[in-house]
Interface confidence: low
């Protein structure tokens, strides 16, 4: 073992270094002192450190550690924060488009219903937005309210337009009859199934991203213990007390110290891994009725089909309701001409064709791939921080917390540290309360994510599948079938391209009335949106 270098006779180097940490030199000895009052940098001989300097070093060491931790998590934090914002905005855009598609359908096909229909549709999609953001709204109630509100208007405006004003107090009866008589057939139930499943998954997806931000924020702002501060001080600053200004800590020693300091944080690792894998499972399942983009953008077609269903049964229905709601029919229902095909106005559905299309789905998968590169983030933190702070390469000629050594030996270092500080003790103390809380939150979200993504027949799908709601797929082409069956059906090719509302914002007020019946070609809407470089750091 090489002899310790002679101490700086004047503590000059130490004074100039410490001056940068703490203006004023009153705490720095002018010449080496015995240092018997030191508690961390226990001297083997004369030292250039005082107790006050030690305290300042500890404070600085903890601050350094906090900064290193924050810079370590910066990229991950940015990734999740930006994607949470991006997806929240994207979902809002999808909801807005879905509302406008639905309003356009009413304006083009049922202009006599529009004032009230717009109001009900607006309320429904407002509730959809609130639900996605976590509001305690029941999806079935939302759908029921939409159809409960629509039916009296459909009945009084379309089916029995000659009702006198005195008979218009039957609205409450009509709302009740709507369910009793299943006037819309199974369409409300179909919509409930699709909307509740897709929104539930969307909501948990956003919740999970927001919790991801909370996890990073929590670990980002951890206050390290005094014990950790002492270890860091010994590693980073105690060499200065011996005048060893250029010596770097041994890499192996740094890892031991970091593992001690990070013992609590590293406990998050298991749940963080599970979080990313559970989120991936959820994302992999977000298609068809588990994809809100697919479901909401097809709602206008399903609602259109449901109204056609009412119209097809209007004769019998009018008689039944006449008795049920105790009002006399003013005139027989005359089946007006309601075209089977949906009018789609090109102005309402302006399209931006883009070569590199990007769907919400592909964006989700891209996020998961990026998140998976951070799957070992917490277990790798000690090593990451050591690699981003000054350490000696190959563990040669380095500082082991007590002295300059030619080669670092973990066993020797630990034996030498026993009197000063027990690393094992630090690890056994367990995580900070804030870490325990965030672990509990991760456990909870992982539980929810697992519940959402049961691969072999999700628990509550069984009966619904048996009722045939998901039968009748559109075949093997790329297009996803949306809405019910029949002539009113529409294909939305490759789904909405989201985020940058480049070419249009649907404005129903600008949409002309019933111009002309759409051709089959018009019915194949390609709604392409490009992400562009609006959020360039993620591109």
């Amino acid at each position: 073992q090489p002899p310790p270098p002679p101490p700086d006779a004047t503590c000059h180097q130490v004074r100039s270094f410490f001056q940068r940490l703490q203006p004023g030199l009153k705490w720095v000895p002018e010449t080496p002192v015995p240092g018997s009052d030191l508690q961390v940098c226990l001297p083997k001989g004369p030292t250039c450190c005082s107790r006050k300097m030690e305290e300042k070093y500890q404070l600085t060491a903890r601050l350094n550690m906090e900064q290193l931790l924050q810079s370590a998590s910066m990229e991950l934090k940015f990734l999740i924060i930006q994607n949470a914002a991006v997806f929240q905005e994207a979902f809002e855009i999808v909801v807005r488009h879905a509302k406008n598609y639905t309003n356009a359908m009413f304006k083009n096909n049922y202009p006599s219903l529009t004032p009230q229909a717009f109001e009900f549709v607006g309320e429904f999609f407002t509730d959809v937005s609130l639900y996605i953001l976590g509001s305690d709204i029941n999806v079935d109630d939302m759908v029921n309210e939409l159809f409960d509100s629509l039916f009296p208007v459909i009945y009084t405006q379309l089916m029995n337009p000659g009702l006198p004003d005195s008979a218009l107090d039957i609205n409450e009866c009509l709302r009740g009859a709507r369910r009793d008589l299943k006037v819309f057939g199974n369409f409300p139930k179909l919509i409930m199934t699709q909307v509740s499943k897709s929104l539930q998954v969307t909501r948990i997806f956003l919740q999970a991203l927001n919790l991801g931000i909370e996890v990073i924020n929590t670990t980002d702002h951890l206050k390290f213990s005094k014990d950790c501060g002492r270890m860091l001080t010994r590693m980073w600053y105690c060499s200065y007390c011996q005048g060893l200004m250029m010596v770097k800590p041994c890499g192996g020693y740094c890892n031991v110290v970091m593992q001690g300091c990070m013992a609590g944080v590293v406990e998050i690792d298991k749940y963080w891994r599970e979080y990313i894998l559970s989120l991936e499972e959820l994302v992999n399942g977000m298609y068809r009725i588990y994809d809100m983009e697919n479901v909401l953008l097809g709602l206008f077609s399903t609602i259109h089909d449901s109204i056609q269903y009412v119209q097809k049964n209007a004769g019998k229905l009018t008689t039944t309701i006449g008795k049920l709601c105790a009002h006399s029919q003013q005139r027989q229902y005359r089946s007006a001409y309601y075209p089977e095909d949906l009018f789609i106005d090109k102005k309402v559905l302006k399209v931006a064709h883009v070569e590199h299309e990007e769907t919400l789905s592909s964006r989700r998968r891209e996020l998961i791939q990026k998140l998976k590169s951070f799957i070992s983030f917490y277990s790798a933190l000690p090593g990451y921080i050591c690699s981003h702070s000054p350490v000696a390469e190959n563990d040669t000629l380095c500082w082991n917390g007590q002295e300059l050594v030619e080669r670092y030996s973990q066993k020797a270092a630990r034996n030498g540290m026993k009197n000063q500080f027990n690393l094992h003790e630090l690890k056994m103390k367990g995580p900070e309360p804030v870490v325990s809380q965030i672990i509990d939150k991760l456990k909870h979200i992982n539980q929810l994510l697992r519940t959402m993504s049961m691969p072999k027949g999700r628990v509550l799908d069984k009966n619904l599948d048996e009722e045939g709601f998901e039968s009748g797929d559109c075949g093997d082409d790329e297009d996803e079938c949306i809405g019910g069956s029949g002539d009113g059906m529409i294909k939305v090719k490759n789904q909405l391209r989201f985020l940058a509302e480049l070419a249009y914002d649907l404005d129903v007020d600008d949409a002309p009335g019933n111009s002309q019946q759409a051709t089959p070609k018009d019915n194949e809407i390609s709604t392409f949106h490009n992400l562009g470089n609006v959020h360039s750091p993620l591109k």
Epitope: D136, N138, V139, D140, M192, S196, K443, Q447, L448, R450, T451, M454, P455, K456, G457, V459, L460, K462, N463, L464
Partner: antibody, heavy 117, light 108 residues
């Protein structure tokens, strides 16, 4: 505090039906799924099925398919389990249990159903 | 429907450790929950997700799960621990919750 209060004991004849209720309080009824579990005298626990009080959708154990019906009344925060075509081997204590995607954190006190001619 | 096998009974002296096993094919890949049931009472959750303990459950109760066996361990057994214990898993192949056969713990 969370409570699940079940209806009282029932004695039924073979071939009859029984409807057991489970009234929930102390939490948002529609936020938690409810399961039904039964236990024959001196026997183990047996899972019967699940109901989502929010939408009313259900999933039943294969063994009880066609004989069991689970329903809910959100206005009274009550779930019901009806078992038809009763036989003597259906004599058991029937429990409702609150579920949130994992373990059962709260159970009802149990309802003894005796099937005897 | 897969069977979760538990020993019918386990006897243990006060202050000693009781271990209750729950055997099932590749049970380590599933989350296991454990319930305690005293005579005439509803079951009570004692361990969930293999090893987590609900608030109010003493630290003496712990769980582990790997391979084909999950284990509930009760250390420093007390007279009040005398009860039936059941393990439970979600079986994805049948979309059923499955309970173990149950173990009666007797404190000598």
């Amino acid at each position: 505090q969370v409570q699940l209060v079940q209806s009282g004991a029932e004695v039924k004849k073979p071939g009859a039906s029984v409807k057991v209720s489970c009234k929930a309080s102390g939490y948002t009824f529609t936020s938690y799924y409810m399961h039904w579990v039964r236990q024959a005298p001196g026997q183990g626990l047996e899972w019967m099925g699940i109901i989502n009080p929010s939408g009313g959708s259900t999933s039943y154990a294969q063994k009880f398919q066609g004989r069991v019906t689970m329903t809910r009344d959100t206005s009274t925060s009550t779930v019901y389990m009806e078992l038809s075509s009763l036989r003597s081997e259906d004599t058991a204590v029937y429990y409702c249990a609150r579920w949130h995607g994992g373990p059962y954190d709260y159970w009802g006190q149990g309802t003894l159903v005796t099937v005897s001619s | 429907q897969p069977v979760l096998t538990q020993p019918p009974s386990v006897s243990v002296a006060p202050g000693k450790t009781a271990r209750i096993t729950c055997g099932g094919n590749n049970i380590g890949s599933k989350s296991v929950h454990w319930y305690q049931q005293k005579p005439g009472q509803a079951p009570v959750l004692v361990i969930y997700y293999d090893s987590d303990r609900p608030s109010g459950i003493p630290e003496r109760f712990s769980g582990s799960n790997s391979g084909n066996t999950a284990t509930l361990t009760i250390s420093r057994v007390e007279a009040g621990d005398e009860a039936d214990y059941y393990c439970q898993v979600w079986d994805s192949s049948s979309d059923h919750y499955v309970f173990g056969t149950g173990t009666k713990v007797t404190v000598l």
